[in-house]
């Protein structure tokens, strides 16, 4: 997260760290007791490593009573996701067992009504992604509030030049932005999961390159079918 601040510890109990061989790779969001939603491209970076999910964490390194690392029983990328595009960039991870819920571990309600969030709405994005252009990684969860950007502006040639489909949404990126390592994390508007950080190799913090988020409401049928 660029231009953000440290999050209040455990105030986002839905927040997950998707890890490979014990290292943070991507963000994720607990959407059901045994399921974490993340970004499909995160799996590509995992190669043949062991994928696990950390729940109940604030610090990645320090011991915390609520922290627990779960093995992944099943990884289900969206069937239409492709390595060369950010389309359908969603991944569902089934935990090896149901998460132990509590004040620091709780699923987040996700948007089912397929309607665009009003431009200008302030939404919260959180993650353990890099906090500087130099690539510094934080130990503790960071967050930032970002205004939603209308799709027409996001589709301008100097922004994302028509690449933003109706299944995506954008948020402003003027110094405050999601960045490398935040992919798969949640964009939360009014206490509801609206978007998932896409995992393209986008420049961060440049206002002409807004953050791109996969709209979960657009994938309600797929999410329901996997969770069923």
């Amino acid at each position: 997260i660029l231009g953000g601040r440290e999050a209040e510890a455990h105030a986002r109990p839905y927040m997950a760290s998707v890890q490979v061989n014990g290292e943070h790779l991507c963000g994720g969001v607990l959407v059901a007791e045994q399921w974490v939603l993340s970004a499909a491209h995160c799996l590509e970076d995992a190669a043949d490593g062991k994928v696990q999910v950390l729940l109940g964490a604030h610090s990645l390194s320090q011991p915390e009573p609520s922290k627990r690392l779960y093995d992944v029983l099943r990884a289900v990328p969206h069937p239409d996701s492709r390595p060369d595009t950010i389309d359908h960039d969603l991944l569902l991870l089934q935990l090896s067992e149901k998460a132990t819920l509590g004040p620091a571990v709780r699923p987040l309600p996700w948007q089912r009504v397929d309607r665009d969030v009003e431009p200008g709405t302030l939404c919260d994005v959180a993650g353990w992604g890099i906090v500087s252009h130099a690539g510094r990684r934080p130990d503790r969860l960071q967050h930032v509030l970002l205004p939603v950007l209308d799709r027409a502006t996001c589709n301008r040639r100097t922004h994302h030049d028509g690449a933003i489909t109706q299944r995506m949404m954008c948020a402003e990126s003027n110094r405050r932005d999601s960045c490398k390592g935040d992919s798969g994390g949640p964009l939360v508007c009014g206490g509801v999961l609206e978007g998932v950080v896409t995992s393209g190799s986008r420049v961060c913090g440049n206002r002409k390159k807004p953050g791109i988020y996969t709209r979960v409401a657009s994938y309600a049928a797929w999410i329901d079918s996997v969770l069923a």
Epitope: R157, T158, D161, G162
Partner: antibody
Framework: EVQLQQSGPELVKPGASVKISCKAF????????KNWMRQRHGESLEWIGD????????NYNQKFKGKATLTVDKSSSTAYMELRSLTSEDSAVYYC?????????WGHGTLVTVSA | DVLMTQTPLSLPVSLGDQASISCRSS???????????LEWYLQKPGQSPNLLIY???NRFSGVPDRFSGSGSGTDFTLKISRVEAEDLGIYYC?????????FGGGTKLEIK
């Protein structure tokens, strides 16, 4: 299939105004800026301005400020350009184009002829 | 405004020949985001312009690979490796990095 359908040719008198339209088909109108260009006979293209179909906010080439006014009607997925105080210099083909990707989609053009 | 100067004004070619069109901008057209918004359009008689190349060298979908774009800073080139009859028309370069966006004066590709 993306299509931009422009209104038909206009013959107008000097000093009058004209409003030409550009109706969008095959995509969500509010997802892309609409741009307008002018091409006089045998000449190159000039950018007039653009409009955000969500907010109605328009940007103009300084050269066309006071001459062109851009508006949209979201309910009919239509962009409009009004040209006022017309002179023979304004006789041209006027194009609308969708921005994103680049100017990949253009209307067929509207010929405006200013003549007494 | 950024002036886009195209040369030549007219380019007579034989079918199957290579054609090369130059476009020079009066100032650098590298955008503040690092990208260069230089595009090429082909306008056939009585038609609207068609996008060929965007961001200097990227072919738009459906554009044959005989079209290629290159250049940087202020100097750009469009090459057509083997001219076909359907390629005839007026070619325009365009910069979208600075406001107002501007087009070149055009190069007419015609049969020798």
């Amino acid at each position: 299939e993306v299509q931009l359908q422009q209104s038909g040719p206009e013959l107008v008198k000097p000093g009058a105004s004209v409003k030409i339209s550009c109706k969008a088909f095959g995509y969500t109108f509010t997802d892309y800026y609409k741009n307008w260009m002018r091409q006089r006979h045998g000449e190159s293209l000039e950018w007039i301005g653009d409009i955000n179909p969500n907010s109605g906010d328009a940007n103009y080439n300084q050269k066309f400020k006071g001459k062109a006014t851009l508006t949209v009607d979201k309910s009919s997925s239509t962009a409009y350009m009004e040209l006022r105080s017309l002179t023979s210099e304004d006789s041209a083909v006027y194009y609308c184009a969708r921005e994103g990707p680049s100017f990949a989609y253009w209307g067929h053009g509207t010929l405006v002829t200013v003549s007494a | 405004d950024v002036l886009m100067t195209q040369t030549p004004l007219s380019l007579p070619v034989s079918l199957g020949d290579q054609a090369s069109i130059s476009c020079r901008s009066s100032q650098t057209i590298v955008h503040s985001n690092g990208d260069t918004y230089l595009e090429w359009y082909l306008q056939k008689p009585g038609q609207s312009p068609n996008l060929l190349i965007y961001k200097v060298s990227n072919r738009f979908s459906g554009v044959p690979d005989r079209f290629s774009g290159s250049g940087s800073g202020t100097d750009f080139t469009l090459k057509i490796s083997r001219v076909e009859a359907e390629d005839l028309g007026i070619y325009y370069c365009f910069q979208g990095s600075h406001v107002p966006p501007t087009f070149g004066g055009g190069t007419k590709l015609e049969i020798k």
